[in-house]
């Protein structure tokens, strides 16, 4: 799913207020809902009929520093016999997410939002024929 | 996938520098990679063997204001005959993501990061027995 463009209005002050100085805003320290509970089924990446592997990318100047990307293992899907069925397709499920980029020059540190496209997992789909008149 | 805790070090200045005043940081306006392309297969939510619906949540004081949640349609998976096969399980694929929360009192506007758990889609898995000795 795609994050809509900011349109540069979300981060602006109301029109009746003085503009933000120097093109930056105040970001409070701390994260809301930092301890929220994730209860996802176990090992779904290997149990799925469209299984996937994970690759971890690491960047110390990004929050979160660790971003995990999924890659589908097969073109087709795994059938009840454990064999690949190429009459079905394994396809990635993608999600746009926000990360925070840290930029520093000496003791001057600033942050900027960045969009990252994450492949979260894969799903098995029936092929579709489109475009043909 | 779960976002690790901040540990409150990412947003700190180097130790040799004066601390951040007032518990806030400088967030630059604009978003890196704002125009990046999402190229996901068409209609995978209805073509999947573990199909899902989308629900849109809207909050004008959140960026992105629109967060889309997937919800699996079935307990089981859809077989080649289009019938539900309850010997297999449709399970949600979830991803922790960051959003930005806007807080304002009059002309004073600040922002804070917030973790949100997003269900991105569903996948079909084989049942697994665990724990049992």
């Amino acid at each position: 799913r795609k994050i809509p463009k900011v349109g540069h209005t979300f981060f602006q002050k109301p029109e009746s207020c003085p503009p933000v100085p120097g093109g930056s805003m105040k970001l409070d320290i701390g994260i809301i809902n930092e301890n929220q509970r994730v209860s996802m089924s176990r090992n779904i990446e290997s149990r799925s009929t469209s299984p996937w592997n994970y690759t971890v990318t690491w960047d110390p100047n990004r929050y979160p520093s660790e971003v995990v990307q999924a890659q589908c293992r097969n073109l087709g899907c795994i059938n009840a016999q454990g064999k690949e069925d190429i009459s079905m397709n394994s396809v990635p499920i993608q999600q746009e997410t926000l990360v925070v980029r840290r930029k520093h020059q000496g003791c001057s540190v600033s942050f900027q939002l960045e969009k990252v496209l994450v492949t979260v997992g894969c799903t098995c789909v029936t092929p579709v024929i489109h475009h043909v008149q | 996938r779960k976002i690790p805790k901040v540990g409150h070090t990412f947003f700190q200045k180097p130790e040799s520098c004066p601390p951040v005043p007032g518990g806030s940081m400088k967030l630059d306006i604009g978003i890196i990679n704002e125009n990046q392309r999402v190229s996901m297969s068409r209609n995978i939510e209805s073509r999947s063997t573990s199909p899902w619906n989308y629900t849109v949540t809207w909050d004008p004081n959140r960026y992105p204001s629109e967060v889309v949640q997937a919800q699996c349609r079935n307990l089981g998976c859809i077989n080649a005959q289009g019938k539900e096969d309850i010997s297999m399980n449709s399970v949600p694929i979830q991803q922790e993501t960051l959003v930005v929360r806007r807080k304002h009192q009059g002309c004073s506007v600040s922002f804070q990061l917030e973790k949100v758990l997003v269900t991105v889609g569903c996948t079909c898995v084989t049942p697994v027995i665990h724990h049992v000795q």
Partner: nanobody, 128 residues
């Protein structure tokens, strides 16, 4: 082997009550959460109730809230579904299942999902 056996179904008049039992073997309720589901003729299986022994949490589908109650007897390794104020729309085969995941906020088809094993089911018929 993980096994579940339901009992207690039958024919009852609208407004009546039944208590279904789900006897588990091959595991304890610490290993899995328990879901109650039902399937009416020509319809897909749907969630009715969830139970987790770890903290006693329960969850009910909107259609049965206030009428159905789930409970457990850990000594007997049995989960019960007490069904009151039964309606003709409650007619279905009722199944219990051992499930891996119980998450009320989940965007699964029901709050308990990822079934490990189904019971064989017990028929409940509510006449008007």
């Amino acid at each position: 082997e993980v096994q579940l056996v339901e009992s207690g179904g039958g024919l009852v008049q609208a407004g009546g009550s039944l208590r279904l039992s789900c006897a588990a073997s091959g595991f304890t309720f610490d290993d899995y959460d328990i879901g109650w589901f039902r399937q009416a003729p020509g319809k897909e299986r749907e969630g009715v109730s969830c139970f987790t022994s770890s903290d006693g949490r329960t969850f009910y589908a909107d259609s049965v809230k206030g009428r159905f109650t789930v409970s457990a007897d850990n000594a007997k390794n049995t989960v019960y579904l007490q069904m009151n104020s039964l309606e003709p729309e409650d007619t279905a085969v009722y199944f219990c299942a051992a499930v891996n995941t119980f998450d009320e906020s989940a965007y699964a088809a029901f709050a308990c999902y990822d079934v490990v094993r189904w019971g064989q089911g017990t028929q409940v018929t509510v006449s008007s």
